[in-house]
């Protein structure tokens, strides 16, 4: 054997090295990789050093027996059957309340003949639940509402008015407050007749004092 090179590097079971026929001189870098379904244990990169020894021990290829962590899903919690996700492990995603699951709720780690174990599905998504609209309120008797729709989206406002001769008692505008369920901010108003009693009670009457009576009346009177 030459004394100016590093020792030959062997092939490893269930893997290969590149380059496959390396020069074994100082500075040469050799990378080991594993076949699908196997992972490198140890250092995958070896370098021929000044002293003509390899920088690391020879790695090995070990069968992959678990799935990768499928990760968290925003707006959800997850329940895990085994922390290292071995074959047969399950992960359940439950969306936070107010969110809807799109995809598969439960993932299972399956073994494959060729290649690493794989999840039964990709992680789901949790999408914001649609807010329900408010149901239309009927117009008050002797009044009107606008817009005149059966359903009003969350956040919408409706306005009320009364016919001539009627006054509005309550809120003139009410809002569909977003929520689960969405709800009206106030009860609908009513239209009350604007009575004469009400008219006079709300005003003070000023009476001017008449001048003293005289026997003759001015032509102007």
């Amino acid at each position: 054997p030459r004394n100016d090179t590093c020792p030959e590097l062997p092939e490893i079971p269930n893997g290969w090295k590149s380059p496959s026929q390396p020069e074994l001189v100082h500075g040469t870098v050799v990378t080991y990789q594993c076949y699908p379904g196997y992972q490198v244990v140890g250092s995958s990169v070896l370098m021929c050093q000044w002293d003509l020894t390899w920088s690391e021990d020879l790695p090995s290829c070990q069968r992959v027996t678990s799935c990768h962590d499928p990760g968290d899903v925003e707006h959800s919690r997850r329940l895990i059957s085994s922390p290292k996700f071995p074959v047969g492990a399950t992960v359940q995603y439950i969306c936070d309340q107010g969110f809807v699951l799109m995809g598969s709720s439960i993932l299972t780690c399956h073994d494959r003949q060729a290649g690493s174990p794989k999840w039964s599905d990709r992680a789901p998504k949790c999408l914001l639940e649609q807010l329900k609209p408010c149901h239309g309120l009927s117009a008050p008797e002797n009044g009107a509402r606008s817009p005149e729709k059966q359903l009003h989206p969350a956040g919408a406002t409706i306005h009320f008015s009364c016919a001539p001769g009627y006054v509005l008692k309550g809120q003139a505008s009410i809002k569909c407050v977003p929520g689960h369920p969405s709800h009206w901010s106030d009860p609908p108003p009513i239209c009350r007749a604007a009575s004469l009693d009400g008219f006079y009670n709300s005003r003070s009457l000023d009476v001017a004092k008449a001048p003293a009576a005289s026997s003759t009346l001015d032509a102007a009177h």
Partner: antibody, heavy 116, light 106 residues
Framework: EVQLQQSGPELMKPGASVKMSCKAS????????IHWVKQNQGKSLEWIGE????????GYNQKFKGKATLTVDKSSSTAYMELRSLTSEDSAVYYC?????????WGAGTTVTVSS | QIVLTQSPAIMSASPGEKVTMTCSAS?????MHWYQQKSGTSPKRWIY???KLASGVPPRFSGRGSGTSYSLTISSMEAEDAATYYC?????????FGAGTKLEMK
């Protein structure tokens, strides 16, 4: 409807571990997740974690990771919670409950007292 | 985590009186749930999904709210309503409970 039967009260020494049980009867055990909730002397309630009896999946409140270990035995319709390295802070009533986003059914609670 | 603040902490009401207690969240939540607990017993689900009454809950109870502000109302107080009421959300992890409102009979 499901009923949840919890194990009896426990008087424990500081540093010890305690394991309590929650047995379900009256409905399909695997239809619901089982949750554990702590109620301390101040009466506040804290969620510890949950287990899905069907798949054995477990989720914890980060605060109780390392303190509580949840397990389930599907064959006996029983959930378990072990608390380790007990201190006086762990003295409380521990409830199991069933549900998804709220707790429909509650057990009667297991009282744990930690005292030297 | 979301903090739920219940107020008042303690309140008392006369028979027939209308009672309202509130639960305020530190961030917006989608739904609120309420539990009733009487001394020495476990909590009972009382109102769920903000406004739905659990089975067996009298119709004098109601719940409403959205965003960060929720409330439980009893239209006419009765002796059997004296208890502690807790609110709870699960709009993010972990779920949390309020510290409770203790309702006493005058």
């Amino acid at each position: 409807e499901v009923q949840l039967q919890q194990s009896g009260p426990e008087l424990m020494k500081p540093g010890a571990s305690v394991k309590m049980s929650c047995k379900a009867s009256g409905d399909t055990f695997t239809d619901y997740n089982i949750h554990w909730v702590k109620q301390n002397q101040g009466k506040s309630l804290e969620w510890i974690g949950e287990v899905n009896p069907n798949i054995g999946g477990i989720g914890y409140n980060q605060k109780f990771k390392g303190k509580a270990t949840l397990t389930v035995d599907k064959s006996s319709s029983t959930a378990y919670m072990e608390l380790r390295s007990l201190t006086s802070e762990d003295s409380a009533v521990y409830y199991c409950a069933m549900g998804r986003w709220y707790f429909d059914v509650w057990g009667a609670g297991t009282t744990v007292t930690v005292s030297s | 985590q979301i903090v739920l603040t219940q107020s008042p902490a303690i309140m008392s009401a006369s028979p027939g009186e209308k009672v309202t207690m509130t639960c305020s969240a530190s961030s917006s939540v989608s739904y609120m749930h309420w539990y009733q607990q009487k001394s020495g017993t476990s909590p009972k689900r009382w109102i769920y999904d903000t406004s739905k009454l659990a089975s067996g809950v009298p119709p004098r109870f109601s719940g409403r709210g959205s965003g960060t502000s929720y409330s439980l109302t009893i239209s006419s107080m009765e002796a059997e309503d004296a208890a502690t009421y807790y609110c709870q959300h699960w709009s993010s992890n972990p779920p949390t409970f309020g510290a409770g409102t203790k309702l006493e009979m005058k």
